[in-house]
Amino acid sequence: APVRSLHCTLRDAQLKSLVMSGPYELKALHLQGQDLEQQVVFSMSFVQGEESNDKIPVALGLKAKNLYLSCVLKDDKPTLQLESVDPKNYPKKKMEKRFVFNKIEINNKLEFESAQFPNWYISTSQAENMPVFLGGTRGGQDITDFTMQFVSS
């Protein structure tokens, strides 16, 4: 069976939107009005992995681009990157570990935990216009909570 996907945008708990910053990086900043068209639309795919009521494994691709968020070790540190893939093969039900995030729903907020690096989360900075990154702390300065807005395909 083909993998189930939906299109959405994400905003962090401070209502910052995510936009492209160069070819392989996302940044978070406040957008208003027509500028909201700059925000990236994700293709969220529901993939194979350990699932529970509040935890669902997903992969986060960029709509109409051959790019997926992936988590790899760089200089001994878990790192978030945008990775190009062959569009003929992606998305797929059995994604490589580095592409899988546990989408965790808590109090109407979403967290995205790396399946490869437990307790590391997609994060944004308090500051404006900073890169989206993989952070190893929740509840601290950095933001790990997001809301999801559905986009019609």
């Epitope: 350990e50 790899v72 190009s84 059995k94 490589e96 580095r98 490869q116 690096f117």
Partner: antibody
């Protein structure tokens, strides 16, 4: 230091089953990011990745063995298994287990291998 | 599946030679490539990972390079103990696939 030792190989008839074991020491397969794979080498041929299991139980298989082979682990025994059913002549090979950490994989430590011969 | 091609199945060289072994992927593998050495009766050894990173304990005469689809293992000055078979492995996409191997023989 890390050691991996394969066992369970032997001669088996086509269509029959065999279970290989990979006993390891020097690391724990409950450590996050850790994985163990099975790789085989047919006589006089190159290496072929067969199956893999991650610390969290996530499994992957080569198309050539999907539905016939099952990889599993027993963390308390520090052992990974490869259950091989419906064996075919083309499964004849030396089977190695190897350890990796994180995806993308590079296999850091390897065992010496165990020979499986499928023949009537 | 991603095909990995080591176009040279065997290579003859002498001690002290500089040797390059190549590996070509059927699509871009994002530098997710590792190199292994195999000798008869010995455990397989990891030499290079992530295209160019030298695994601990591996002599510095071994180096790796490449990007996209084309990758190279170089031995700067061949030693007696380097005569062996060398394999590449791509980790970009499941199923993970090896090259067919290049056997390095004494000239």
């Amino acid at each position: 230091q890390v050691q991996l030792v394969e066992s369970g190989g032997g001669v088996v008839q086509p269509g029959r089953s065999l279970r290989l074991s990979c006993a390891f020491s020097g690391f724990s397969l409950s450590t996050s990011g850790m994985g163990v794979g099975w790789i085989r080498q047919a006589p006089g041929k190159g290496l072929e990745w067969v199956a893999h299991i991650w610390w969290d139980g996530d499994e992957s298989y080569a198309d050539s063995v999907k539905g016939r082979f099952t990889i599993s682990k027993d963390n308390s025994k520090n052992t990974v298994y490869l259950q091989m059913n419906s064996l075919r002549a083309e499964d004849t090979a030396v089977y190695f287990c190897a350890r990796n950490r994180y995806d993308p994989p590079w296999f850091v430590d390897w065992g010496q291998g165990t020979l499986v011969t499928v023949s009537s | 599946d991603i095909q990995m091609t080591q176009s040279t199945s065997s290579l003859s060289a002498s001690v002290g030679d500089r040797v390059t072994i190549t590996c070509r992927a059927s699509q871009d593998i994002s530098n997710y490539l590792s190199w292994y050495q195999q000798k008869p009766g010995k455990a397989v050894k990891l030499l290079i990972y992530y295209t160019s990173k030298l695994h601990s304990g591996v002599p510095s005469r071994f180096s790796g390079s490449g990007s996209g689809t084309d990758y190279t293992l170089t031995i700067s000055s061949l030693q007696q103990e380097d005569f062996a078979t060398y394999f590449c492995l791509q980790g970009k996409m499941l199923p993970w696939t090896f090259g067919q191997g290049t056997k390095l023989e004494i000239k």
